[in-house]
Interface confidence: low
Amino acid sequence: SAPGEDEECGRVRDFVAKLANNTHQHVFDDLRGSVSLSWVGDSTGVILVLTTFHVPLVIMTFGQSKLYRSEDYGKNFKDITDLINNTFIRTEFGMAIGPENSGKVVLTAEVSGGSRGGRIFRSSDFAKNFVQTDLPFHPLTQMMYSPQNSDYLLALSTENGLWVSKNFGGKWEEIHKAVCLAKWGSDNTIFFTTYANGSCKADLGALELWRTSDLGKSFKTIGVKIYSFGLGGRFLFASVMADKDTTRRIHVSTDQGDTWSMAQLPSVGQEQFYSILAANDDMVFMHVDEPGDTGFGTIFTSDDRGIVYSKSLDRHLYTTTGGETDFTNVTSLRGVYITSVLSEDNSIQTMITFDQGGRWTHLRKPENSECDATAKNKNECSLHIHASYSISQKLNVPMAPLSEPNAVGIVIAHGSVGDAISVMVPDVYISDDGGYSWTKMLEGPHYYTILDSGGIIVAIEHSSRPINVIKFSTDEGQCWQTYTFTRDPIYFTGLASEPGARSMNISIWGFTESFLTSQWVSYTIDFKDILERNCEEKDYTIWAAHSTDPEDYEDGCILGYKEQFLRLRKSSVCQNGRDYVVTKQPSICLCSLEDFLCDFGYYRPENDSKCVEQPELKGHDLEFCLYGREEHLTTNGYRKIPGDKCQGGVNPVREVKDLKKKCTSNFLSPEKQNSKSN
């Protein structure tokens, strides 16, 4: 039985009748094929479902699509295939849903080989109507909406042309040829790389980075010798080939590419890679691959300029084969990230940081769990979380870790308890305090989702057999109740709930199979009658985040401030509601040396919080010294951690030093990189 199933559990009475009245079945009249589902808009209740199947004929494969629409969160569906003229839709492009609540949808159709261009179907009224548009090119990528204006679309063609539309795909214009990668920036800016001789692959490392701020009327070349580029927060990154060899380095810009600075990160060889793990407007987490096929690298965290980096975590797992990393932003609590490291003995261990990469630690062993066979000491071990890497290795892990910004403190994940990740069948664990403490929530692997901002957690057992039971909890996973949603079990394929965890509806997708037929089926369950009343003030309690000792004034200070949240009591069975807003009370902390990182040319000795001047600059520090910009080489040794809001307290001011004097080398100082404009 699941943990917590004891007499103490606050049971929901008469839930079977309440749920039975709110369970809606829909059978889709297709062969099984494949199905994709998209939510259109926020809190609109509109869902589009595209089913696709291939009929193998003697000479060719004939594809057929069906399009269904729901406007009541999946309780009822209407076949709207006629709106797209019964055309076969290319599922690899998915359904391109417009940003925010624009109500825009683009579907890309399959067209016959000889056609001049592709075909799209466009809707701007939440898929009530579609307009067919023939394109002057064959699309290579899904249509990309400008985040600022959903009427502006860009796409790459199979011939590497960059095409832009200013009227939501009605008319298209090719604004540039020989384009490898294109991305929207802020203010309707487009960044893209181009090749000169032959192809993107052949010119890798010799690409040019361009920018247009007026949808293709004018262009500026903002980088040369480019290997790749990326956008993260307010930072634009480019990896640039070195002049002298086949290594490349990261350069960063915070002004859309007008000026660039070399990042103080190691250069990488041709067989290595950089990866932006996470970025916001304050800082970036950067993974730098180790030389050789090690499967790991180092995480660095940046300063507010994206230029100076502190080593955050060694031996960070990032496989070179499938490009898998377990790096996870725990969105339910500020500053928390979870990832995996590859230890010396090649076992994989989970690490967590509560202060945005400042310090990493193992996850605390759950109280209600024993250490498994991987533990040397049966009394001392940690929780290890299964994420992308475990899923890629086909371990019995149906879902990655889950957290939601509006379900404060809740983290749900598959894990094992020992000295390292185990290949044994995992259990599901929950934390209600952002990862500080954990409890086993369910035995064995499950699919899970959060509803009503954490008021309900729903789970379905991961099984190869047909299922007809769903589990739910109204007290953050302490107690579970089971509901049989159908008499006829189905082969389960997925749980779907509206993104944002505000909904009280869950859709269970699967298929039924008998001797002659196989059909898609969905069951949508509305939990509104389980949570009968709206939550009131008495249902909430004050919770101090990151806090272990409420008596200590500094306790809970993360990045210079602490926060108190109003959280739903576990015993309260009520609706947070769709309009629920997280209530938090921040208070500023006094500054300590922990609130500062060491600037370029300085380091923290082991177990010391002071920044000490490096006696000599070596390796990539020396390169940064030589090639970095003058103004970045003048420092007092400390720099406030990005996003840190502390005030008063320690102010580590000391004399400003010009580190340019330490930049001695037999290299010639290269010319500054200038961007040329067309």
Epitope: K201, A202, L204, K244, D245, T246, G269, Q270, E271, Q272, F273, D289, P291, G292, D293, T320, T321, G322, G323
Partner: antibody, heavy 129, light 107 residues
Framework: QVQLVQSGAEVKKPGASVKVSCKAS????????MSWVRQAPGQGLEWMGI????????SYAQKFQGRVTMTRDTSTSTVYMELSSLRSEDTAVYYC??????????????????????WGQGTTVTVSS | EIVMTQSPATLSVSPGERATLSCRAS??????LAWYQQKPGQAPRLLIY???TRATGIPARFSGSGSGTEFTLTISSLQSEDFAVYYC?????????FGGGTKVEIK
């Protein structure tokens, strides 16, 4: 045009050493790695190792470890391959080949290999008593 | 090390016909594979890199395909100058390794 010109044929006694040179022209010498490949009479191709002309770092195939030394002289854009403790089975044609790859190691699946795109004409080394 | 196995060892084909050469890797090499042509008394010549991209100046009748462990070199219509030995080579993991070669001879 891009060219690799190797030194002339050599006849050596068993136990001796041989040093083959490979002079590059027509491109920036330090922009590409250089591999050495050999081919015994009537046999296939065998990779011996690679050198990075920038810092001179090398990676050798296990089979030749301890017997082979690859060096370079950036002032003359020349790489050298020296093989010591010669045996009769070292009789082969030795080729240098421009190799745009990195030092022999695996990278992400997206890494792209360009192949050894320019080869020297070959140097015949005969080991006979 | 990664072992590259080519088949067949010898392929007898008439001019104008299609030739299909196979190369198998003992473990995945992704697309880090090249094909070379070698004629008697000459140095090898790069034909295909990245498993499927033709090198500069190589005629369109040569094409490469595959990724992971199985690769194919196809010569769509053999010309007299195509009779030679063909080698595949991986550059996924050191040491680089070559296949044993396939000799394409006139039938």
């Amino acid at each position: 045009q891009v060219q690799l010109v190797q030194s002339g044929a050599e006849v050596k006694k068993p136990g001796a050493s041989v040093k083959v040179s490979c002079k590059a022209s027509g491109y920036t010498f330090t922009s590409r790695y250089m591999s050495w490949v050999r081919q015994a009479p009537g046999q296939g191709l065998e990779w011996m190792g690679i050198i990075n002309p920038v810092g001179g770092s090398t990676s050798y195939a296990q089979k030749f470890q301890g017997r082979v030394t690859m060096t370079r002289d950036t002032s003359t854009s020349t790489v050298y391959m020296e093989l010591s403790s010669l045996r009769s089975e070292d009789t082969a044609v030795y080729y240098c080949a421009r190799d745009p790859s990195g030092i022999a190691a695996a990278g992400p699946a997206s890494r792209y290999y360009y192949g050894m795109d320019v080869w020297g004409q070959g140097t015949t080394v005969t080991v006979s008593s | 090390e990664i072992v590259m196995t080519q088949s067949p060892a010898t392929l007898s084909v008439s001019p104008g016909e299609r030739a299909t050469l196979s190369c198998r890797a003992s473990q995945s090499v992704s697309s880090n594979l090249a094909w070379y042509q070698q004629k008697p008394g000459q140095a090898p010549r790069l034909l295909i890199y990245g498993a499927s991209t033709r090198a500069t100046g190589i005629p369109a009748r040569f094409s490469g395909s595959g990724s992971g462990t199985e690769f194919t070199l196809t010569i769509s219509s053999l010309q007299s100058e195509d009779f030679a030995v063909y080698y595949c080579q991986q550059a996924r993991l050191g040491p680089w390794t070559f296949g044993g070669g396939t000799k394409v001879e006139i039938k």
